[in-house]
Every structure is written in structure tokens, then in C-alpha cells.
């Protein structure tokens, strides 16, 4: 019997009856065996077929068989009710081999030309199955030339049989106090050849309760207990199950905090599985009774292990554990049925003793030393020298534990120094001056830093002075030694202040005239205001009415006296304001350059001379009494004058402070 080509030779070719295309002879038998590679099949079709027709193709025929199965027995030219001719049909081997047998009997009634067929190997698509047949793969089937392979959805793994998908259903641990677990794919059929282990692991003290819910369907057997698929429940005390069949198992009260559920399936069956709802219970804790002025949240019928409650106090009350204040309180029920923390108290909020007010005092209004919720206190500033800034000083102890003003401020009120107070109540009768008495010029500041100069205290941490007096120290503010509160230049009993920063007017040019001869010194600490240390007021808008020609101003300082030495005691001089044109004219002649006196300056002194400020007085204040407020204000800053102090026809020249109020206010507010 002639053999067809065998793999690995190319598997395709042509078969024909003997003598084709001529007629075939009688008594012929020819057999072809075709073999394709594994995973392939053979396809065969006829391009010519002309065989003697006989009942059931008993005389001449072509038989196609694959393995033990006959695929077709063919004869004639066209199919009849009982005989089959191939026509345009294509025939496929069932496996990788195909046997073709041709046979002719002893006679032919007329000549027949036989057959011609073509064959080829082609890949089998194992993934395609006939309706009703079991699928090749459990989940996904992947065909390829010569074969196929199966794969599984996420959460499954391919069984070693290479077709079944076993569920990856082990290692799940449930730690919540209640929950649900079910067989994989529930309520759809559970997977085959799977072994699932679920753990419920609660904190010690809890007891797990299992309830089977909805439906239960696990493959069973009428005689043997769960031989195929089964569910088992194991605790540290006992084992429950195995369970199978269609009846919901009863509730299981495990009396254990750990449960292991095992579910095992075999390779067959189509069942929906099971669903368990689990809960837990524990020994209850005593019912919490809220403290006075407090309440419990949440309110529950009972509290068991891990349950918690919080205590919230009424407005104006705060949580206290012993004597310690708590931001919040939450107690947790423990396994032994006791709470982990004792009940706190709701104690009335105590704002505590109010902070001391710098330069002020505090008075208890509600009652002596009463500092609890809704208590009222009254701050006030030290009379005479301080006044309270934008605040009535009334503070209430609020629920947040802070003393709060009527405007809702939690910060202390501010006691601002009162400015312009002096022991000298009126202007009246340095160079040609008189000795100052205590409290006359409490704003007077002595500035030492290379030379002796002066300044005037503003507020309680600023000094107003002349730019030329502190120019050399503008980059080394700490070199300035600032003294106040003394009349004697050489007394050790002064109040020491130190400079934090020096601000020189940006329009001042050193050694090029004295326009904009103004500077501010910021002190590194506030000074205490008293009768010897009091700030000078800045001029009000209306101040010019007290600074007209011939109005009297007072200059003070430790500058040169008629004797040619710095004064040991603070001296002062009362001098009238000089008409601006008159002063300008006095300094138009040499050695003074034209334009020495600017609109930013004012002049003061006697035409006859003899009363003047002098070297060492620079930076000091020329002050005026505001008769409306009865406060002294700074109208000028000692700036420059003639080489010979107190010279007739020459005047002291002072920086006109009112021109610089915006500059002063900007610097003080910014720094």
C-alpha cells in the first residue's frame, strides 16, 4: 500500500486513481496513509470523482478513515439517498492521520475515469468545540500552530492538568468584627479542583458567630458523606462539618476568636456554592454614666469589646482626668469587660490668672480671683503715663479657656505711653539757658557714639534725632549708647537703651547741607515710662498754629555752654520762631552757600543772639506746648546754625518735623 508523505516532510499533495485521467482497471485496491505533525489535521477534497455507482457503494468506492473511524465511503458521480459522492465537500481527519482506500470490483458496466484529490495538513483549532461538547479550557483557550494552551482569569491558577482553573482562594484573613465570605464566583458555579482556606481572626475576647445565608449548593453523594466537594469549619476548640448538599447549615456559635474555613472541590460538577455572614460578640462593659455637665456619644444599648464612647462637655466646661486637662476623651471596652480609662469630669473652664499687662494692672470684676467661664476682668493702664489703645480693657473668660475682649481679641490690650507730659506746664523764660529740673524734659535722650548728641523719645521704643548726629553709626546701630531718665550727663543712674536699627531719611546727603536732617532709631527693648522718661508727641495737623513766627519753643541738651564745655546738667532755652524769609536771608551771605535754609527747616533764636542750641545738642527736640491738648510736641530737631553759637543776627536751624509725619509713621508702622 503506497504511503503518503510523513511529517516532517511537507504535508500536501495529490492523489489519483490508477491510470487517471484514463479509466481505472478492474480489481484494483490502492491505499494511502497520510500523516500530519502533532496538533495538525489533514484536509482532503476532490477535484474529479467518477466511480461506478452501486448500492451502498459495494462495488467500487473510495473510503476515508481516520483512526478507527470511517469518515466517508464514496462512489458514483453525485450523491443519492443511500450513496454519497464527494461533490464539493472537504474532508478532515480526526487526528493527525488520514487513510484513503480505493477499490474497484471485477467489472464495470461502462468505463469510469476514477478520481483526483488534493490534500494538505492544517492546524487544528482545538479551542473550537462543537455545541454540547465540554470546552477545551476552563477559562481562556489560546490556539497556536500545532497546539493550544489554557490560561486563567485573575485570582485563578492553571491546574496541573493544564485545562482546569483552580481558584486562588487561600490566605484571605478577615479581621473586622463582622463581614461576609463566600465560595469563589458565588452565586455562579464555583471553580473545580480548588482548595480554599479563609481565616477569621479577631482580637482575643471576641467570639465569632457564623450564619449561612441565601443559598447552599455543594456537590454531594446519596450514600457517602461529601466525597466530592466539601466545606469544613475549624476553630481552636472543634471542627464543624464537612458540609455539602443543598440545605443551609445551622448557625455556628464558635466561642472562638479565630476560625478557619476550608472549601475543597473536585474536577467535576456545576454547583453554586455557599455564602456566610459572620458576626462577633464579647463580654459587655458597664454602661457608661455621663459626668455632670457632660454627655456620652454614641449612645448604644450595650458596649462590648472594642466599642468606644466619647465624653463631650457642655459649653464652658472642659474634660479633666484628675487634675489634667484633656483635649478629648474616648474610652474603649476591653476583653475583660472593663473600660480602659476611668470616667473623666467635666469641670468648668478656668482661664487661669490673667497675664500681667505691661505698664498696666488687672482687676477681678466677677469676684476676687474668679477666673472661671464667664468671669469678667478689667485691665487698665498705669495712670498718668499710659493710656489703653483701642480697647475698653474688659475681658471675659470664654469656653476655649482664653480671656477674650469684647471685640473677640485674645491678645492683651496695649498700654501706650502718654506723650508730651512735662513738669513744665507753660513756656517761659544750652547756650544762654537754664538748668532743667527733674521731669522737665523726660523725652530727652543722650546719644553717645563717637560724639555727644541728643534725641527725643517717641512712643516707648523709638528715638527721633538728626540724621547728621547718627550718620556714622547707620550701619552699626549697636554702637550707639542711648541714655535717658537722667539730668546729669555723667551720672551712672541712667536708663540704658540700645539701638536695634537706624533709619536715616533717604533725602539726607551727608556733608552736603542739612536738608532732610532727620533720623529714627529703633530701640531693641521698650523702655518703662515714668516721670523721668516720657515720650514727646508728634505734631498734630493743627500744630502749625502753635509754631508761627515769634511763638516760643524750648530746646534742651547737654551741648556746649557759654563756657565752651559740654554741660554736666541738662540745660534748656526758650526761643522764638524766626520768620522764614528773615532766616533764609541770614544764611544767604558767605560762608553759607545759597539755599542753605530750605522749606524743610525752621529757625529759632533771638536777633540779638545769646540764646541758642549748640554742638552736642544736635538731634534734640525743639518742643512746643499744644495749648488745646496741654501736651508738648516736637516741632523741630536741632540741626545746624552759625559756627559761633548764639551769634547776633544768626539763628539756630531746626528740621521741620511736621513735614516728615508720613515718613515717621511709615517707618514706625513698618518696623
Amino acid at each position: 500500500t503506497p504511503l503518503g508523505p510523513k511529517w516532517p516532510e511537507p504535508v500536501f499533495g495529490r492523489l489519483a486513481s490508477p491510470g487517471f485521467p484514463g479509466e481505472y482497471a478492474n480489481d484494483q485496491e490502492r491505499r494511502w496513509t497520510l500523516t500530519a505533525p502533532p496538533g495538525y489535521r489533514l484536509r482532503l477534497y476532490f477535484t474529479h470523482f467518477d466511480l461506478e455507482l452501486s448500492h451502498l457503494c459495494e462495488y467500487d468506492f473510495v473510503k476515508l478513515s481516520s483512526g478507527a473511524k470511517v469518515l466517508a465511503t464514496l462512489c458514483g458521480q453525485e450523491s443519492t439517498d443511500t450513496e454519497r459522492a464527494p461533490g464539493k465537500d472537504t474532508f478532515y481527519s480526526l487526528g493527525s492521520s488520514l487513510d484513503i482506500t480505493f477499490r474497484s470490483d471485477y467489472s464495470n458496466e461502462k468505463p469510469f475515469t476514477g478520481f483526483e484529490a488534493f490534500y494538505a495538513a492544517e492546524d487544528i483549532d482545538e479551542c473550537q468545540v462543537a455545541p454540547g461538547e465540554a470546552p477545551t479550557c476552563d477559562h481562556h483557550c489560546h490556539n497556536h500552530l500545532g497546539g493550544f494552551y489554557c490560561s486563567c482569569r485573575a485570582g485563578y491558577v492553571l491546574h496541573r492538568n493544564k485545562r482546569t482553573c483552580s481558584a486562588l482562594c487561600s490566605g484571605q484573613v478577615f479581621t473586622q468584627r463582622s463581614g461576609e465570605l463566600s465560595s469563589p464566583e458565588y452565586p455562579r458555579p464555583y471553580p473545580k479542583l480548588s482548595s480554599c482556606t479563609y481565616s477569621i481572626s479577631l482580637e482575643e475576647g471576641f467570639s465569632v458567630i457564623l450564619d449561612f445565608v441565601e443559598s447552599f449548593d455543594v456537590e454531594t453523594h446519596p450514600e457517602t458523606l461529601c466525597p466530592y466537594d466539601f466545606l469544613k469549619i475549624q476553630t481552636d476548640r472543634e471542627e464543624h462539618g464537612p458540609f455539602c448538599g443543598k440545605t443551609l447549615p445551622h448557625r455556628i456559635e464558635t466561642k472562638s476568636n479565630t476560625v478557619t474555613i476550608t472549601f475543597v472541590t473536585d474536577e467535576s460538577g456545576d454547583h453554586t456554592g455557599w455564602k456566610i455572614h459572620y458576626t462577633s460578640t464579647a463580654q459587655p462593659c458597664p454602661y457608661p454614666m455621663a459626668p455632670p455637665n457632660g454627655h456620652v456619644s454614641p449612645v448604644q444599648a450595650k458596649y462590648i469589646l472594642k466599642d468606644s464612647f466619647s465624653i463631650f462637655c457642655e459649653t464652658g466646661y472642659e474634660l479633666l482626668q484628675g487634675h489634667l486637662p484633656l483635649k478629648s476623651f474616648t474610652a474603649v471596652c476591653q476583653k475583660d469587660g472593663s473600660w480602659d480609662r476611668p470616667m473623666p469630669a467635666c469641670s468648668i473652664v478656668d482661664c487661669g490668672p490673667p497675664d500681667d499687662l505691661p505698664s498696666g494692672r488687672v482687676e477681678y470684676i466677677t469676684g476676687p480671683g474668679v477666673t472661671t467661664y464667664k468671669a469678667v476682668i478689667q485691665y487698665s493702664c498705669e495712670e498718668t503715663f499710659y493710656t489703653m489703645k483701642v480697647n475698653d480693657g474688659k475681658y471675659v473668660c470664654e469656653a476655649d479657656g482664653f480671656w477674650t475682649s469684647s471685640k473677640g481679641e485674645k491678645s492683651l490690650p496695649v498700654c501706650e505711653p502718654v506723650c508730651g507730659l512735662s513738669a513744665r506746664t507753660t513756656g517761659g523764660r544750652i547756650y544762654g539757658g537754664q538748668k532743667a529740673k527733674p521731669g522737665d524734659f523726660p523725652w530727652q535722650v543722650l546719644i553717645l557714639g563717637g560724639t555727644t548728641a541728643a534725641g527725643a523719645l517717641l512712643y516707648d521704643n523709638w528715638v527721633l534725632t538728626a540724621a547728621h548726629a547718627v550718620y556714622e553709626q547707620k550701619h552699626d546701630a549697636s554702637a550707639l549708647d542711648i541714655r535717658m531718665g537722667t539730668l546729669k550727663r555723667l551720672s551712672p543712674h541712667y536708663t540704658q537703651a540700645w539701638s536695634e536699627a537706624v533709619f536715616i531719611h533717604e533725602g539726607y546727603t551727608h556733608d552736603a547741607g542739612f536738608d532732610n536732617d532727620i533720623a529714627l532709631i529703633k530701640l531693641n527693648n521698650k523702655v518703662v515710662i515714668n516721670s523721668n522718661i516720657t515720650p514727646i508727641c508728634l505734631p498734630r495737623k493743627e500744630a502749625e498754629s502753635f509754631m508761627r513766627t515769634d511763638d516760643i519753643g524750648t530746646a534742651s541738651g547737654w551741648g556746649l555752654t557759654q563756657r565752651g564745655f559740654l554741660a554736666r546738667n541738662l540745660m534748656y532755652v526758650d526761643i522764638p520762631i524766626v520768620d522764614h524769609q528773615k532766616c533764609t536771608a541770614a544764611y544767604e551771605k558767605p560762608p553759607y552757600p545759597r539755599g542753605s535754609v530750605t522749606a524743610n527747616m525752621l529757625c529759632a533764636g533771638l536777633e540779638s543772639g545769646g540764646k541758642d542750641s549748640c554742638r552736642g545738642d544736635s538731634g534734640g527736640a525743639l518742643v512746643f506746648l499744644d495749648s488745646e491738648t496741654e501736651r508738648w510736641f516736637v516741632g523741630g530737631i536741632v540741626s545746624w546754625g552759625s559756627m559761633n553759637c548764639g551769634e547776633a543776627g544768626q539763628y539756630g536751624v531746626y528740621t521741620k518735623v511736621i513735614n516728615y509725619i508720613p515718613w515717621i509713621e511709615n517707618i514706625i508702622s513698618d518696623f
Epitope: 546729669k488 555723667l490 551712672p492 540704658q496
Partner: antibody, heavy 121, light 106 residues
Framework: QVQLVQSGAEVKKPGASVKVSCKAS????????MHWLRQAPGQGLEWIGD????????HYIEKFKDRATLTIDKSSSTAYMELSSLRSEDTAVYYC??????????????WGQGTLVTVSS | DIQLTQSPSSLSASVGDRVTITCSAS?????MYWYQQKPGKAPKLLIY???NLASGVPSRFSGSGSGTDNTLTISSLQPEDFATYYC?????????FGQGTKVEIK
């Protein structure tokens, strides 16, 4: 040269008073503040107070406000310190010292030799 | 009142040693002053305004510091330097002294 010469040692009974003198020479007496300090046996230094010889302005620390009196005699350039109601714990060497006038004015550049005052019954 | 605490209270050193005495203030002080006192004698000014050497004081003495911590240093101890040293402040009224540091011969 600048010198401060103090009076000699004194022995006093409790309750009595003592007046220690300090004569200055070699400088303008009224230009410098005069300070008084004391040192108990084996102890540190303690400031009592000071006086301005130009006008007799005085300052005392709280502890000595009621018992110490500082005075000046300009004509003899002498400073005095009187301590009343003496107690045994007032036993000490008492110093006069000149205050500096060059920088801060708050230290002592010249000291007297000291006067030992013993208070004992 | 500002308290001044000197350390050590006493020390033993040899001629040629470098000696450092510290003075710690209970509050910040601007300037510190140092005095030397020998037995039976009045104190003598060594350092003023923290770091300035008083007239006639040898340059082996130096002062430094700021705020609450100040130091007197003797770079090379000489026989005549064995004495008690005091720090003094008057940044805050009243003026106060340290308790003293006694420098003895080892």
C-alpha cells in the same frame, strides 16, 4: 597721682553707728561720683550706694536705704559713709571707689585701701 | 537683681598656664567688668566694657563675651596673677558682683 585714702579700722558695738571717711586727691573731686562698697570676711563684694559730690545727689540699694548715709565735704574733698544700727553681720571691710566718667560711668577705676569695721559686743 | 555666677570658684594653675574664668548672668548684660583682688588689698580694675583693658593692665589679660556669658582669660599666668577675680555688671540696677574665683599656685 589719683588717690583715695580711707580712715582707720573701727570696732563698734551692736546698735551703734560708724562713720568712715574717704579723702580724694589728684583729681577734680566734684567731677566723679563716689561709690561705697563692702566685703564681709571671706565673702564677695557688695555695693551700698553712691553720691555725686557736685550736688550731693545720693542713691542707695534697698538693703541700706534706711541705715546708710552718704555725705560730702567739698572743701576737704572728702566723702563719708555712715552706717547706723550696726549688727554683727555688718562686720566687713568698707571701700570707697571712684566711678569712671569715660564710658558707661558704671565701674570703678580707683579704690580706697579699705576700712575694717568690726561689730562685736 | 541680676545674679552673676563665676566658675570655677577656685582653680590651681602653674606659671605659664592659660586660665579662663567664666561669669554667667541670670539675664542678658550689655557690659561686663573684671577686677583683681589680692589678700588684704582693694580690688583693681582689669577689664571694662567687656573687652577693654584698663590702663596699666598687662596684655595677657583679655575679656570677651556677650549676653549672659562672659569670660576673663589670662593667656600666660604670671606669679603676680595669683589672686581672686570678680566680675561686675550694671546693665540692670542695682550693680552686682560675682562671688569670685580664687586662682592659686598648683
Amino acid at each position: 597721682q589719683v588717690q583715695l585714702v580711707q580712715s582707720g579700722a573701727e570696732v563698734k558695738k551692736p546698735g551703734a553707728s560708724v562713720k568712715v571717711s574717704c579723702k580724694a586727691s589728684g583729681y577734680t573731686f566734684t567731677n566723679y561720683w563716689m561709690h561705697w562698697l563692702r566685703q564681709a570676711p571671706g565673702q564677695g563684694l557688695e555695693w551700698i550706694g553712691d553720691i555725686d559730690p557736685s550736688d550731693s545727689e545720693t542713691h542707695y540699694i534697698e538693703k541700706f536705704k534706711d541705715r546708710a548715709t552718704l555725705t560730702i565735704d567739698k572743701s576737704s574733698s572728702t566723702a563719708y559713709m555712715e552706717l547706723s544700727s550696726l549688727r554683727s553681720e555688718d562686720t566687713a571691710v568698707y571701700y570707697c571707689a571712684r566711678g569712671d566718667i569715660t564710658t558707661t560711668l558704671r565701674y570703678f577705676d580707683v579704690w580706697g585701701q579699705g576700712t575694717l569695721v568690726t561689730v562685736s559686743s | 537683681d541680676i545674679q552673676l555666677t563665676q566658675s570655677p570658684s577656685s582653680l590651681s594653675a602653674s606659671v605659664g598656664d592659660r586660665v579662663t574664668i567664666t561669669c554667667s548672668a541670670s539675664s542678658s548684660v550689655r557690659y561686663m567688668y573684671w577686677y583683681q583682688q589680692k589678700p588684704g588689698k582693694a580690688p583693681k580694675l582689669l577689664i571694662y566694657d567687656t573687652s577693654n583693658l584698663a590702663s596699666g593692665v598687662p596684655s595677657r589679660f583679655s575679656g570677651s563675651g556677650s549676653g549672659t556669658d562672659n569670660t576673663l582669660t589670662i593667656s600666660s599666668l604670671q606669679p603676680e596673677d595669683f589672686a581672686t577675680y570678680y566680675c561686675q555688671q550694671w546693665s540692670s540696677y542695682p550693680l552686682t558682683f560675682g562671688q569670685g574665683t580664687k586662682v592659686e599656685i598648683k
